[in-house]
Amino acid sequence: NWVNVISDLKKIEDLIQSMHIDATLYTESDVHPSCKVTAMKCFLLELQVISLESGDASIHDTVENLIILANNSLSSNGNVTESGCKECEELEEKNIKEFLQSFVHIVQMFINTS
């Protein structure tokens, strides 16, 4: 599932390059392993912002699929309460390209520990 999430992120990156979305998004670029579920939640919430701002059907479908995949991969630990983690709004705001790069990095963390 996580490999498919990375495929979807690449697809979103390609789709966005053909558009002009200059949004800045809350981005966790240095994820601590004990906060990775919280960070994933923030990434997914911000992805929905991309979907809404783009108004693009392909981006919308890909984001929705990505959330479904991530949900299923995290169904056993998605409700784990991680303490001492930053709230999404406390994260640094970065452009979409940097946001997606950081997203791929966190997904790779999940792949490495699964």
Partner: antibody, heavy 122, light 112 residues
Framework: EVRLMASGGGLVQPGGSLRLSCAAS????????MSWVRQAPGKGLEWVAT????????YYPDSVKGRFTISRDNSKNTLYLQMNSLRAEDTAVYYC???????????????WGQGTLVTVSS | DVLMTQTPLSLPVSLGDQASISCRSS???????????LEWYLQKPGQSPKLLIY???NRFSGVPDRFSGSGSGTDFTLKISRVEAEDLGLYYC?????????FGGGTKLEIK
């Protein structure tokens, strides 16, 4: 008023195939994900398949995965369910349903068609 | 898979009474983004199911306010404050937080 009309049901032998259709009208079909749900005689509801708005993504339970294929033709406002290798336990009324977006709404099936009966028997 | 268990199987009521249907999931159905995709559907005899409640407590358009949904995590409830004749039928809870999406077994609301 949103309209969904399922058709294509009938009697088919075990191992056979059938294609169900669902004609949609009175809404912008391409703006909605769609699902199929079935109900065996005297039994409860079972989710069968979901397809994304553009048709790129599909989801199935293990009970039908590899045998059933959900697809859509947005130019014809029509949803399909191709059912292969049919079994007696696939006998049911099949409903098509419109899905509200996860991102902009509640991810619920807000309107349902009237259903079409599929009977698998020799 | 998430197992959805509804109780009771059958609920005999008098018109005007309050009715309460319970739905329990085998694991939390709060998704990673914090949403709980739990719906309630009503299927009247000989008809297609109809959406009543989505995301635990949101009433679908046109659904009377005597219907209310509540709950969190794994325990959910549908309440009908004053049962009317048109409310009779089969009620199903449904989770679509995790694939495969799953229905409860159904609760038949009938006249006592």
């Amino acid at each position: 008023e949103v309209r969904l009309m399922a058709s294509g049901g009938g009697l088919v032998q075990p191992g056979g195939s059938l294609r169900l259709s669902c004609a949609a009208s009175e809404f912008t079909f391409s703006n909605y994900a769609m699902s199929w749900v079935r109900q065996a005689p005297g039994k409860g509801l079972e989710w069968v398949a979901t397809i994304s708005r553009g048709g790129d993504y599909t989801y199935y339970p293990d009970s039908v995965k590899g045998r059933f294929t959900i697809s859509r033709d947005n130019s014809k406002n029509t949803l399909y369910l191709q059912m292969n290798s049919l079994r007696a336990e696939d006998t049911a009324v099949y409903y098509c349903a419109r899905r509200v977006s996860m991102i902009t709404g509640g991810w619920a099936m807000d309107y349902w068609g009237q259903g079409t009966l599929v009977t698998v028997s020799s | 898979d998430v197992l959805m268990t509804q109780t009771p199987l059958s609920l005999p009521v008098s018109l005007g009474d309050q009715a309460s249907i319970s739905c329990r999931s085998s694991q939390s159905i709060v998704d990673i983004t914090g949403n709980t995709y739990l719906e309630w559907y009503l299927q009247k005899p000989g008809q297609s199911p109809k959406l009543l409640i989505y995301k635990v407590f949101n009433r679908f358009s046109g659904v009377p306010d005597r219907f209310s949904g509540s709950g969190s995590g794994t325990d959910f409830t549908l309440k009908i404050s004053r049962v009317e004749a048109e409310d009779l039928g089969l009620y199903y809870c449904f989770q679509d937080s995790f694939v495969p999406y799953t229905f409860g077994g159904g609760t038949k609301l009938e006249i006592k």
